[in-house]
């Protein structure tokens, strides 16, 4: 089985975390699907879902969440518009499927959201627009209430120093690759 | 240093299916996306889609669509793309390109291979 | 689809030049915007990344700008070896899509 991995990202106040979670087309391309928090020790909470069936390339706000399914693509788009510290945690996407439990994807997403100035390189320093501005046509989505208890066995290691990876340790804060991440304000 | 190096040129006859290669070093492979993008002679880049050489999964362009197939074998850190019925509008050269990283929103074509011809004649 | 226009599609100019390329889309693509230049028969190379960041190594009289629709492109003193073909291409919405290029000589 693959093993759980994390990305870890760190973001100033104010910016925006864009990720894209990968599915199999063939199979989930329409199905619904979610986005989560993980808490140290507790279920995972849903915070926004796409639509049931997911629309292609519909946009669904959430309050500073955007989900975009691209189902040509099997990607899953997520947006987390103007971060706040408390936004620091452990994210990941699934796909429902009931009446089976929910279908994690890879990678989870650790977000660290510090304090100070947003400018960083990747970011342009002089931008003070909201680079998303969402269309008027976007879409609420009610989400499922369960939530599978096998996804929570353990709590979820604290640093991507505890995680097992397929290859190399995933830490974007210590890799010796040039890592582009679009950062904007 | 960050190599991605591509299977030699083809020549095939319409309806035939071809096979090219993209093999990556100097980098972890399951950690970029591997992207596809094709150049007919004179003509623009043409986005063809995108793997996720970790999970295999893979994403296409409509135009594309059961026509070509993404592959990968990660013990050897290579990629393949195969566009099958093919025809005289598919001579091009084929290009692979990493992409950002696979949990990233971005498609930043940083390294890119050399290219592989592929001419569909009768 | 996002269309990318680029203008011009080809012009001339000489050494020490100051030449500005466009690339205009469909609609607001952010600053989600690339930039690369391909010289005969080699492989696009990526010049400039998310709008106006400078790829590493790339030469800084190369630059770019905008956001929303309308970006531009500049290399700020034309040079003998920056003859080649440049394309945008945009990644805010799938499928990814190029401009239709823009070819500098020297004159």
């Known amino acids: 089985a693959t093993k759980l991995t994390e990305e870890k990202y760190e973001l100033k106040e104010g910016q925006t975390l864009d990720v894209k979670c990968d599915y199999t087309l063939e199979k989930f391309a329409s199905s619904q699907k979610a986005w989560q928090i993980i808490r140290d020790g507790e279920m995972p909470k849903t915070l926004a879902c796409t639509e049931r069936p997911s629309k292609n390339s519909h946009p669904v706000q959430v309050g500073r969440i955007i989900l975009e399914d691209y189902h040509d693509h099997g990607l899953l788009r997520v947006r987390m518009v103007n971060l706040q510290v408390e936004d620091s945690g452990l994210y990941q996407c699934v796909i429902y499927q009931p009446p089976k439990e929910p279908h994690m994807l890879f990678d989870r997403i650790r977000l660290v959201v510090t304090k100070g100035f947003s400018g960083t390189p990747g970011s342009n320093e002089n931008s003070t627009q909201n680079v998303y501005k969402i269309p008027p046509t976007t879409t609420k989505a009610l989400c499922p209430l369960y939530t599978s208890p096998r996804t929570v066995t353990q709590a979820p290691p604290k640093s991507t120093a505890d995680v097992s990876t397929p290859d190399s340790e995933i830490n974007l804060t210590n890799v010796t690759d040039i890592i582009r991440v679009p950062v904007f304000n | 240093q960050v190599q991605l190096v591509q299977s030699g040129a083809e020549v095939k006859k319409p309806g035939a299916s071809v096979k090219v290669s993209c093999k990556a070093s100097?980098?972890?492979?399951?950690?970029?996306?591997i992207n596809w993008v094709r150049q007919a002679t004179g003509q623009g880049l043409e986005w063809m889609g995108r793997?996720?050489?970790?999970?295999?999964?893979?994403g296409y362009v409509q135009n594309f669509r059961g026509r070509v197939t993404m592959t990968r074998d990660t013990s050897i850190s290579t990629a393949y793309m195969e566009l099958s019925s093919l025809r005289s509008e598919d001579t091009a050269v084929y290009y692979c390109?990493?992409?950002?990283?696979?949990?990233?929103?971005?498609?930043?074509?940083?390294?890119w291979g050399q290219g592989t011809l592929v001419t569909v004649s009768s | 689809d996002i269309q990318m226009t680029q203008s011009p599609s080809s012009l001339s100019a000489s050494v020490g030049d100051r030449v500005t390329i466009t690339c205009q889309a469909s609609?607001?693509?952010?600053?989600?915007l690339n930039w690369y230049q391909q010289k005969p028969g080699k492989a696009p190379k990526l010049l400039i990344y998310?709008?106006?960041n400078l790829e590493t190594g790339v030469p800084s009289r190369f630059s770019g700008s905008g956001s929303g629709t309308d970006f531009t492109f500049t290399i700020s003193s034309l040079q003998p070896e920056d003859i080649a073909t440049y394309n945008c291409q945009q990644y805010d919405k799938l499928p990814l899509t190029f401009g239709g290029g823009t070819k500098v000589e020297i004159k």
């Open positions: 998310d709008t106006s």
């Open positions: 609609q607001d693509i952010s600053k989600h």
């Open positions: 100097g980098y972890t492979f399951t950690s970029y996306d």
């Open positions: 793997m996720n050489p970790k999970s295999g999964n893979a």
């Open positions: 390109a990493r992409g950002g990283r696979t949990s990233i929103w971005s498609f930043v074509f940083d390294y």
